[in-house]
């Protein structure tokens, strides 16, 4: 799996998707977790319903909410209020029995301020709002990772 | 703001069938789960099944499996409930609730009242 | 089926006393719990939703605990229109099923 990077910006909402074979992941929950360390596990952040079928409501751990579009195939996270230390490695994940299967690896980037980083394109950021029900999600900057990229810093 | 509008009240006869529509206002439709409801006279609330407009795909309490059929037309944003062999014990008043984001039930109907009686 | 418990069936208090209603879940049902007030001739109302989140417009002296098997709705403050029935329901797994409900009558 090759990892996007999504960007977003300090105190606003970044929208994270994973698009997936809705067939092949017919009837499986999904998650969102975060990857801890290379070698280390992905600690679950937050997963869709636990009845299948409910999948498209949102579920919320936090700041983190999750909701899957079963039949057009995209998983939705939403980081509100996103801080530094949200910043890091993730893992959309397809959830059958103990088993997950990765749908896609993400590399979470917080921009400290737009008007700094012309590569974000000059967005402008709407005010933060109290739910996420009426949050305004910043339009994410995403790429995959070049070849050669580290992912992880390498361990001395 | 959605609403949920529920058609008015029935009676009918035991071994018939009844049909109770509820039409969606504001909102999208298709998206969310309409779930049916029912509670007798003085008791408390059952649930007899789900459906989501987008796929059509339903889920039924068992205690109801082969008697409710519930469907929806995304063209005027109504769900139907549809409940045959009535007996008196079915006497109740039925509900439409729809989720808005959070929970299966976020919002409900007014009810109708559904009396069978000989 | 997960069968839900709600304790007492009654409670009788004043207004300005804390309510406190138990639910509990034959099995556990995570935090996949929803409580629920109703007013006779209304349909319910949902107040709070996955055991301890605030439904939209409900005021805060509603609030909601537990996890797993064992859930709490409290009222902190009881106003005239807080007297009406409560009941909890769980969507941890089909079928969803709702609690008996307790009734919260004025003393």
């Known amino acids: 799996h090759n990892t996007t990077v999504f960007q977003g910006v300090e105190g606003q909402s970044l929208q994270v998707s994973c698009p997936y074979d809705s067939m092949k992941h017919w009837g499986r929950r999904k998650a969102w977790c975060r990857q801890l360390g290379e070698k280390g596990p992905c600690q679950r952040v937050v997963s869709t319903h636990n009845l299948w079928l409910l999948s498209f409501l949102r579920r919320r751990n936090g700041s983190t909410a999750i909701t899957d579009d079963t039949l057009g195939g995209t998983l939705t996270i939403t980081l509100r209020n996103l801080q530094p230390h949200d910043a890091g490695f993730y893992q959309c994940q397809s959830l059958h029995g103990s088993e997950a299967d990765t749908l896609r690896k993400v590399l979470v980037e917080v921009l400290a301020d737009p008007l700094d980083h012309r590569d974000a394109g000059d967005l402008w950021v709407p005010g933060e709002s109290e739910s996420f029900e009426d949050a305004h999600v910043e339009h994410s900057i995403s790429r995959s990772l070049l070849e050669g990229e580290i992912p992880f810093p390498p361990t001395s | 703001q959605v609403q949920l509008v529920q058609s008015g009240a029935e009676v009918k006869k035991p071994g018939s069938s009844v049909k109770v529509s509820c039409k969606a206002s504001?909102?999208?439709?298709?998206?969310?789960?309409i779930s049916w409801v029912r509670q007798a006279p003085g008791q408390g609330l059952e649930w007899m099944g789900v459906i989501i407009p987008d796929s059509g795909t339903a889920n039924y309490a068992q205690k109801f499996q082969g008697r409710v059929t519930i469907t929806a037309d995304e063209s005027t944003s109504t769900a139907y409930m549809e409940l045959s062999s009535l007996r008196s014990e079915d006497t109740a008043v039925y509900y439409c609730?729809?989720?808005?984001?959070?929970?299966?039930?976020?919002?409900w109907g007014q009810g109708t009242m559904v009396t069978v009686s000989s | 089926e997960i069968v839900l418990t709600q304790s007492p069936a009654t409670l009788s208090l004043s207004p300005g006393e804390r309510a406190t209603l138990s639910c509990r879940a034959s099995?556990?049902?995570?935090?996949?719990l929803a409580w629920f007030q109703q007013k006779p001739g209304q349909a319910p109302r949902l107040l709070i939703y996955d055991a301890s989140n605030r439904a939209t417009g409900i005021p805060a002296r509603f609030s909601g605990s537990g996890s797993g098997t064992d859930f709490t709705l409290t009222i902190s403050s009881l106003e005239p229109e807080d007297f009406a029935v409560y009941y909890c329901q769980q969507d941890y797994e089909w079928p969803i099923t709702f609690g008996g409900g307790t009734k919260v009558e004025i003393k």
């Open positions: 609730a729809r989720t808005q984001e959070n929970t299966i039930f976020d919002i």
């Open positions: 099995q556990s049902v995570s935090s996949y």
């Open positions: 504001g909102g999208t439709f298709a998206q969310y789960a």
